[in-house]
Interface confidence: low
């Protein structure tokens, strides 16, 4: 199910108290960037910056809280955006070296 889009970046004084709260902040920021460009969700040129920012945000806070990255919660966020934003995309980026290569409807991109 989609993550809630309400909430604040942190608790008292704006400080992020835990990783769950931080992830929610990352997601809210990402949604703020993605919602206005819904018609371009399958255009990598348009969504590359918010997508990369989301990953950077999740990774930054993971390091801040001394967690590995990706961790299960971060992975759920990534998977969530595939389900919500990229489920109807059919085009696949050709290179394995870019994060968006896995942005496709089936979510699967491994080759034997």
């Amino acid at each position: 199910q989609p993550l809630p889009t309400t909430g604040t970046p942190g608790s008292e004084g704006g400080t992020v108290k835990n990783y769950e709260t931080a992830v929610q902040f990352c997601w809210n920021h990402y949604k703020d960037q993605m919602d206005p460009i819904e018609k371009d969700w399958c255009d990598w040129a348009m969504i590359s910056r918010p997508y990369s920012t989301l990953r950077d945000c999740l990774e930054h806070f993971a390091e801040l809280f001394d967690l590995g990255f990706p961790n299960p919660l971060a992975e759920r966020i990534i998977f969530e955006t595939h389900q919500i934003h990229f489920a109807n995309c059919s085009l696949v980026q050709p290179t394995f070296s870019d994060p968006p290569e896995d942005v496709r409807g089936s979510h699967h991109h491994h080759h034997h």
């Epitope: 967690l67 590995g68 961790n71 299960p72 070296s97 979510h107 699967h108 991109h109």
Partner: antibody, heavy 119, light 115 residues
């Protein structure tokens, strides 16, 4: 896009060995987990551990592997598995496998490399 | 670490029939669906069939179907073919949100013999 293991050998009990997983046609650096799995002769698959290919990635290990096994990313296309204090029970085919996100399963596997521990 | 209990350990079935393999996790898998199924033939590495419990991997026939959630999962192979003779493994990912626990486990395997 493929991966291949190397370094399998005959080693004496209590010895050490380092296996290498090398990627061809792609880089581990972004969005990839690189995992090690072993299979003893005629037996099932056993998960050893994984490491994230990104700069901040840390390894995760099965509880039985902690201490004796070390997974390291040595370059954007190579990951190693260091094994110490080997016993006959460690005799197995060792596979390197990759996945972009944990839930997606290991979509790419190497052919495996054989490690034999015997005196 | 979590434990995956796979049943049966072996099954024999006729061409054209249906085979069902079960996999039970000792605790809920991550996101309730981080469960994959693999097919392995002698001398070969495993081949991914199903991921996230029910998604079909690229190039895998729709005769293979995965289902389940949480701790109980099933692989169903319908219209069994001779080429389906192999050992099948389930594999899950455990993890607690926001922690560095990230563990995987394989089931013991199920040998499918096609008559």
């Amino acid at each position: 896009q493929s991966v291949e293991e190397s370094g399998g050998d005959l080693v004496k009990p209590e010895g050490s060995l380092t296996l290498t997983c090398t990627a061809s046609g792609f880089s581990f650096s972004i969005s990839y987990w690189i995992c090690w799995v072993r299979q003893t002769p005629g037996k099932g698959l056993e998960w050893i551990g994984c490491i994230y290919g990104g700069s901040s990635g840390r390894p995760y290990y099965a509880s039985w592997a902690k201490g004796r096994f070390t997974i390291s990313k040595t370059s954007s296309t190579t990951v190693t598995l260091q094994m110490t204090s080997l016993t006959a029970a460690d005799t197995a085919a060792y596979f390197c496998a990759t996945t972009a996100y944990g839930g997606y399963g290991y979509g790419t596997w190497g052919p495996g490399t054989l490690v034999t521990v015997s005196s | 670490d979590g434990v995956m209990t796979q049943t049966p350990s072996s099954v024999s079935a006729a061409v054209g029939s249906t085979v069902t393999i079960s996999c039970q996790a000792s605790q809920s898998v991550f996101s309730n669906n981080y469960l994959s199924w693999y097919q392995q033939k002698p001398g070969q590495p495993p081949k991914l069939l199903i991921y996230t419990a029910s998604s079909l991997a690229s190039g895998v026939p729709s005769r293979f179907k995965g289902s389940g959630s949480g701790t109980q999962f099933t692989l169903t192979i319908s219209d069994l073919e001779c080429a389906d003779a192999a050992t099948y493994y389930c594999q899950c990912t455990y993890g607690k949100s926001g922690t560095d626990t990230y563990l995987n486990a394989f089931g013991g395997g199920t040998e499918v013999v096609v008559k």
